[in-house]
């Protein structure tokens, strides 16, 4: 999916109002927030591409993020503010329903969510050239 035509300001507002707090809640109670940045993004559409990938694509050691509250709210924000996004996700959602697994918060998941927080922070930067 090409995120170029998303309403970035609306997605930013959704992040600030709820998604950011859900990410903090997920990370709370752990000291394992000291992870190196391994994922970055160079502009807002690129950030959303990386955020989508880390949030919804199962990875080795962390297959359970898509059912988390922050993930569901991320999905809702993208569906509302990115034209045509929801249509591209129908097959992926159906495949996910068949693959429900026991929810386990692993260190790998904590690392992944830490990366997500960094990506979201980059996405939310105020852009000087647009001010």
């Amino acid at each position: 999916y090409d995120f170029t035509n998303c309403d970035f300001e609306k997605i930013k507002a959704a992040y600030l109002s709820t998604i950011s707090k859900d990410l903090i809640t997920y990370m709370s109670g752990t000291k394992s927030t000291e992870f190196n940045n391994t994922v970055s993004c160079s502009n807002r559409p690129h950030c959303l591409t990386e955020i989508q990938s880390l949030t919804f694509n199962p990875t080795a050691g962390c297959a359970s993020l898509a059912k988390e509250m922050f993930a569901m709210k991320t999905k809702a924000a993208l569906a509302i503010w990115c034209p045509g996004y929801s249509e591209t996700q129908i097959n992926a959602t159906q495949a996910m329903k068949k693959r429900r697994k026991r929810k386990v918060t692993t260190n790998k998941c904590l690392e992944q969510v830490s990366q997500l927080q960094g990506l979201w922070r980059r996405f939310n930067r105020p852009l000087l050239k647009q001010q």
Epitope: L23, T33, S42, N124
Partner: antibody
């Protein structure tokens, strides 16, 4: 009015753990986008970024020093803490804390005046 | 970590002339058209003072003889005309990626 002040032991011996405190006012570390960074200036050398901690509790470290550094915060008391384990004479420096902000939310730079730490046998 | 290489390490410039300091980053510090590069001035016994943010934007209250330029990986600080009070050490700093990093510094002396 934003102010920051560093405090530390002044002098300590090699192999000890250095504990520094940054006390600040005029802003909250619970506010989105806010963070505190620790920086040092060794005598006769250049500025060195040590570590940072953000409003969302994410922490980042100078790669070369990461194994020796610990950073934490008490947002309710407006304080951030830095510990450096196993110090030696190369850790003698003026240590600064500074307010950092995600991107460019304002065009200001707020630093403490620094605290001199000497590591000596 | 992003490595910033500053040159020259020291610089002696006559009063009224131009001082030019270069900063090269090990990777781009640009994001969506903005360059996340700052320039600081530091004098002995004082904390660093921000001069330029976002590569080319002058901080309020800083004299217009200071200017910054560049994008991506190559950045420049110019001071013209140099005045006596500009004797100090100058640092570039990237705030694009955690952890933030500084260049090695350039000591400016006024002749």
């Amino acid at each position: 009015q934003v102010t920051l002040k560093e405090s530390g032991p002044g002098i300590l011996q090699p192999s000890q753990t250095l504990s520094l405190t940054c006390s600040f006012s005029g802003f909250s570390l619970s506010t989105y986008g806010m963070g505190i960074g620790w920086i040092r200036l060794p005598s006769g050398k250049g500025l060195e970024w040590l570590a940072s901690i953000w409003w969302d509790d994410n922490r980042y470290f100078n790669a070369a020093l990461k194994s020796r550094l610990t950073i934490s915060k008490d947002a309710s008391k407006n304080q951030v803490f830095l510990k450096i384990a196993s110090v030696d004479t190369a850790d003698t420096a003026t240590y600064y804390c500074a307010r950092i902000e995600d991107g460019y939310y304002s065009y200001h730079s707020y630093w403490g005046q620094g605290t001199l730490v000497t590591v000596s046998a | 970590d992003i490595v910033l290489t500053q040159s020259p390490a020291s610089l002696a410039v006559s009063l009224g002339q131009r001082a030019t300091i270069s900063c090269k980053a090990s990777q781009s510090v640009d994001f969506d058209g903005d360059s996340y590069m700052n320039w600081f001035q530091q004098k002995p016994g004082q904390p660093p003072k921000l001069l330029i943010y976002a590569a080319s934007n002058l901080v309020s209250g800083i004299p217009a003889r200071f200017s910054g330029s560049g994008s991506g990986t190559d950045f420049t600080l110019n001071i013209h005309p140099v005045e006596e009070e500009d004797a100090a050490t100058y640092y570039c700093q990237q705030i694009d990626e955690d952890p933030y990093t500084f260049g090695g510094g350039t000591k400016l002396e006024i002749e």
